[in-house]
């Protein structure tokens, strides 16, 4: 017969669970079963046998069940035995996460991860994560082996930050036992981090002010930062430092205040983990009356103008008014009182009205005084700009700016600007003698350039008032600049050429640069050097030139700024005519004769005359004197063709003749080979 045990060889059971071992036989009708432990300790289990099967049940599994169990089956005289080892473990719960206190930003906290009722502890491992970050991990393999359930923990201290809000804290416990189902050997607990911020930066804003008048109202708003958002409580400190609770809102409004409402008000921000307070002191004062003087503490009045000073009592039902000057000089004005107002009218102010005026208001035996300074000035006209002459590029010019009838001139500033550039600035700070109207002048010299055209010359006069007035009185004059440029780069173009043949047309064109555009004047220079005016056109035209049109022609560019002059010489030439080529004594001579070849041109004295003898090897120029060439003793080789060319710049004429030379012996003619 055969014996089998199930599960085979080895099994694992969790403490507190139930576990069944089954022993069965085949090939035996009525076997006898017996169970024992390898070391013969108590079974700590129940046995139930039915036919060929015996079941050993451990319920609940405990440390006493960690053994090798043996099943013995007897069939007749046969006996068979099988063993199975039972390992036990305990891993019943998910780990627990504990904190040493609430998680407060910036304050270290210890987090503890506990794995409860573990067996065997040496097989335990714990990981602790914050989000994706491993904070710590520990294995407990060095722990003593004891047959008991133990709770093991892993601790980490960290300082929470704002970014930790909402992060998950994960505690993962693993029990490294082969046979446990993977779902059982790893347990984890996840806790979302609840991070707190104790109330801080508690601040109070008070509107309109902490110093108040009787009957007034105040609104105080308190804010406090924290997580969760702090609740706000308002209280008032009593004499014994006890707080009198006033409100549970962020805003506390007090109306119709009395002097006894003065005191220290406390605002407190409170949340789950802390509190933070701020204090403010309110001072409620008795309501005073106020004296107001208008137009202001300083009044600027132009000579001849009228000034109205108004004094008002605010917060007083029946005031009495009085006016005086600081120096107690007589008042030149008219006073009019109307209820809570009094006016002093100064008509047509002059230098004698320049004072500090004081208005005194009496209300229920209390007198308040307010002053205003009346400053007299004169600044009636815009400045006047004058220049020493027209503006010419590169030529210095003097500009003066005159400001008439000014008072007080020791407050005067004159500035002269060219475009955006200050040419000169002057403060007239010299001591004033008697009070009078004065005319002040600012003078400067500058060199205009062409770039200044289009810019403006600005004379700016500022009359600065007393310290109180921020903006000075200002007047200005503007003069656009137009800079002249003396004519320059005067140029003459001659078309077609300054050397011409008699009868040809010619154009002489002149241009000149300058501002304003120069006027053109054509003249002819006479022999005595004087100029004979010809034309005011830019172009001087000769339809048909004559020989006596030759000469020097002068073009002048003229404008307000100067003159520029340029000249050109015109040469009129005559083309050669009536050219004559003669031979003496005759065209046919004997060997040894003297021969004279002459070339003359009747109409042109200044001409080039070239005498040539034609030859196979090329023309040979003959040395002629005044167009004549003499052959002293004619040779046979002197025979040939002679050519005369008369040339000027405008043309040329050509004549030729043939000279024969006869030999002495046989009277034969000798002709050149041409």
């Amino acid at each position: 017969f055969k014996i089998e045990i199930s599960p085979e060889y080895k099994t694992i059971a969790q403490i507190g669970d139930s576990m069944a071992l089954t022993c069965s036989t085949t090939g035996c009708e009525s076997p006898l079963f017996s169970w024992r432990t390898q070391i013969d300790s108590p079974l700590n289990a129940k046995v139930r046998t039915e036919g060929s099967k015996s079941v050993l049940t451990m319920e609940p599994v405990s440390f006493e069940n960690e053994h090798s169990y043996l099943c013995t089956a007897t069939c007749g005289s046969g006996k068979l035995e099988r063993s199975i080892h039972v390992d036990i473990y305990s891993f019943p719960k998910d780990p627990e996460i504990q904190f040493s206190g609430p998680l407060e930003v910036g304050k270290p906290v210890t987090v503890k991860c506990l794995a409860p009722d573990i067996y065997p502890v040496y097989r335990l491992e714990i990981d602790l994560f914050k989000g994706d970050q491993l904070m710590n991990r520990q294995e407990f393999s060095s722990e003593e082996m004891t047959k008991s359930l133990e709770t093991k923990s892993l601790e980490v201290t960290f300082t929470p930050v704002i970014e930790d809000i909402g992060k998950a804290l994960v505690c993962r416990a693993k029990l490294h036992i082969d046979q446990i189902d993977s779902t059982l050997k790893e347990r984890e607990t996840v806790k979302e981090l609840q991070v707190y911020i104790s109330p801080r930066n508690t601040t109070i804003s008070v509107h309109p002010s902490t110093r108040l008048q009787e009957g007034g109202a105040v609104t105080m708003t308190c804010s406090s930062e924290g997580l969760p958002a702090p609740e706000i409580f308002w209280g008032r400190k009593l004499d014994n430092e006890v707080l009198q609770l006033l409100s549970g809102n962020a805003t506390l409004t007090l109306i119709a205040m009395r002097m006894e409402d003065s005191g220290v008000y406390v605002c407190e921000g409170v949340n789950l983990i802390g509190r933070d307070k701020a204090e403010v002191e309110l001072v409620v004062q008795e309501k005073p009356f106020i004296v107001d003087i208008s137009p202001g503490s300083q009044v600027a009045a132009q000579v001849g103008d009228s000034v109205v000073l108004t004094c008002a009592a605010i917060g007083c039902d029946s005031p009495s008014f009085s006016w005086r000057t600081q120096t107690d000089s007589p008042l030149n004005g008219v006073v009019r009182n109307e209820g809570a107002k009094s006016t002093l009218v100064l008509s047509s102010v002059g230098f004698e009205d320049e004072h500090s005026y004081l208005c005194a208001v009496t209300c229920l035996q209390r007198t308040l005084e307010k002053r205003t300074q009346v400053e007299v000035y004169s600044f009636p006209e815009d400045p006047v700009i004058k220049m020493s002459g027209p503006l010419v590029h590169g030529r210095p010019v003097t500009v003066n700016c005159t400001v008439p009838n000014v008072y007080p001139f020791d407050h005067l500033e004159i500035e002269l600007l060219k475009g955006e550039t200050t040419l000169m600035k002057k403060y007239f700070l010299e001591e004033m003698g008697i009070k009078s109207l004065e005319t002040k002048i600012l003078e400067t010299t500058f060199i205009p350039t062409i770039e200044d055209t289009g810019k403006s010359l600005v004379c700016l006069a500022r009359l600065h008032s007393g310290e109180m007035e921020s903006e000075p009185k200002q007047r200005q004059s503007v003069q656009p600049l137009y800079v002249n440029v003396a004519p320059k780069e005067t140029t003459i173009w001659v078309s077609p050429s300054p050397i011409l043949e008699e009868g040809s047309p010619v154009n002489l064109t002149c241009s000149s640069d300058g501002i304003p555009a120069p006027k053109i004047l054509w003249s002819r220079q006479l022999n005595n050097g004087e100029l004979q005016p010809l034309s005011e056109n830019t172009t001087l035209t000769f339809m048909s030139t004559k020989r006596d049109d030759s000469g020097i022609y002068v073009c002048e560019g003229i404008n307000e700024a100067g003159i520029s002059r340029k000249s050109v010489e015109l040469i009129i030439q005559v083309s050669p005519k009536d050219i004559q080529l003669t031979v003496f004594p005759s065209k046919s001579v004997k060997e040894g004769d003297t021969v004279i070849i002459s070339c003359t041109c009747g109409n042109v004295p200044e001409t080039w005359i070239i005498l040539k003898k034609k030859a196979k090897t090329g023309d040979m120029v003959l040395k002629s004197v005044d167009g004549s060439y003499t052959i002293r003793q004619a040779q046979l080789q002197d025979a040939g063709i002679y050519e005369c060319e008369s040339k000027t710049e405008v043309g040329s004429q050509l004549r030729s003749l043939t000279l024969d030379v006869k030999g002495k012996e046989h009277n034969k003619d000798y002709f050149s080979p041409e």
């Epitope: 491992e125 520990q138 294995e139 201290t157 490294h176």
Partner: antibody, heavy 118, light 107 residues
Framework: QVQLQESGGGLMQPGRSLNLSCVAS????????MTWIRQAPGKGLEWVAS????????YYPDSVKGRFTISRDNAKSTLYLQMNSLRSDDTATYYC???????????WGQGTLVTVSS | DIQMTQRPASLSASLGETVSIECLAS??????LAWYQQKPGKSPQLLIN???SLQDGVPSRFSGSGSGTQYSLKISGMQPEDEGVYYC?????????FGGGTKLELK
């Protein structure tokens, strides 16, 4: 008594691979975490890798993560360290120790020298 | 990672002299500290674990103490066989880290 015997060290070129072994005896091998620790010449000790009882959990420092693999064969009572993409700064004596990353290292092998040089 | 700093880096002691080696952790390690001795050319040997528990077979002249971030190893009466390098190691926070070592020589 507990004995740990490393082998497999030697001279290797950078970028190459090497496998170290450690044969354990004198204790029930599968009842302990095992760890490799190294010591560069003339330098201190550095933890290299740890493996749990069955090999289910393995841990490494950033310096070797992704290049080294620790494993074990409980049937052969042998611990391994597969070292890939070797670098010159991996030159060290490699010790096989009994114990996990949180435990004191009570038993050490005699060490095997790995030299990485071109 | 927790930094472990050992002081001094090296020291010489006369025979019978009492020697102290300090180990400083960059944060609290709750006594999870071990001390090792490494003799020239040998493997390290565990002397003390849990900051103060002496391993079996380790002479009683060796003792460990400390808490929080400060720990020390004391040798009460230096012997020739105590020459070597001593290392501390924390196992409190992953990953495990060692001190740089203290070289102890006999004067």
């Amino acid at each position: 008594q507990v004995q740990l015997q490393e082998s497999g060290g030697g001279l290797m070129q950078p970028g190459r691979s090497l496998n170290l072994s450690c044969v354990a005896s004198g204790f029930t091998f599968n009842n302990y975490w095992m760890t490799w620790i190294r010591q560069a010449p003339g330098k201190g000790l550095e933890w290299v890798a740890s493996v749990s009882f069955t090999g289910g959990s393995t841990y490494y420092p950033d310096s070797v993560k992704g290049r080294f693999t620790i494993s074990r064969d409980n049937a052969k009572s042998t611990l391994y360290l597969q070292m890939n993409s070797l670098r010159s700064d991996d030159t060290a004596t490699y010790y096989c120790t009994r114990g996990g990353y949180s435990s004191p290292f009570a038993y050490w092998g005699q060490g095997t020298l790995v030299t990485v040089s071109s | 990672d927790i930094q472990m700093t050992q002081r001094p880096a090296s020291l010489s002691a006369s025979l019978g002299e009492t020697v102290s080696i300090e180990c400083l952790a960059s944060e609290d390690i709750s006594n999870s500290l071990a001390w090792y001795q490494q003799k020239p050319g040998k493997s390290p040997q565990l002397l003390i674990n849990g900051a103060s528990s002496l391993q079996d077979g380790v002479p009683s002249r060796f003792s460990g103490s400390g808490s929080g971030t400060q720990y020390s190893l004391k040798i009460s009466g230096m012997q020739p066989e105590d020459e070597g390098v001593y290392y501390c190691q924390q196992g409190y926070k992953y990953p495990p880290t060692f001190g740089g070592g203290t070289k102890l020589e006999l004067k």
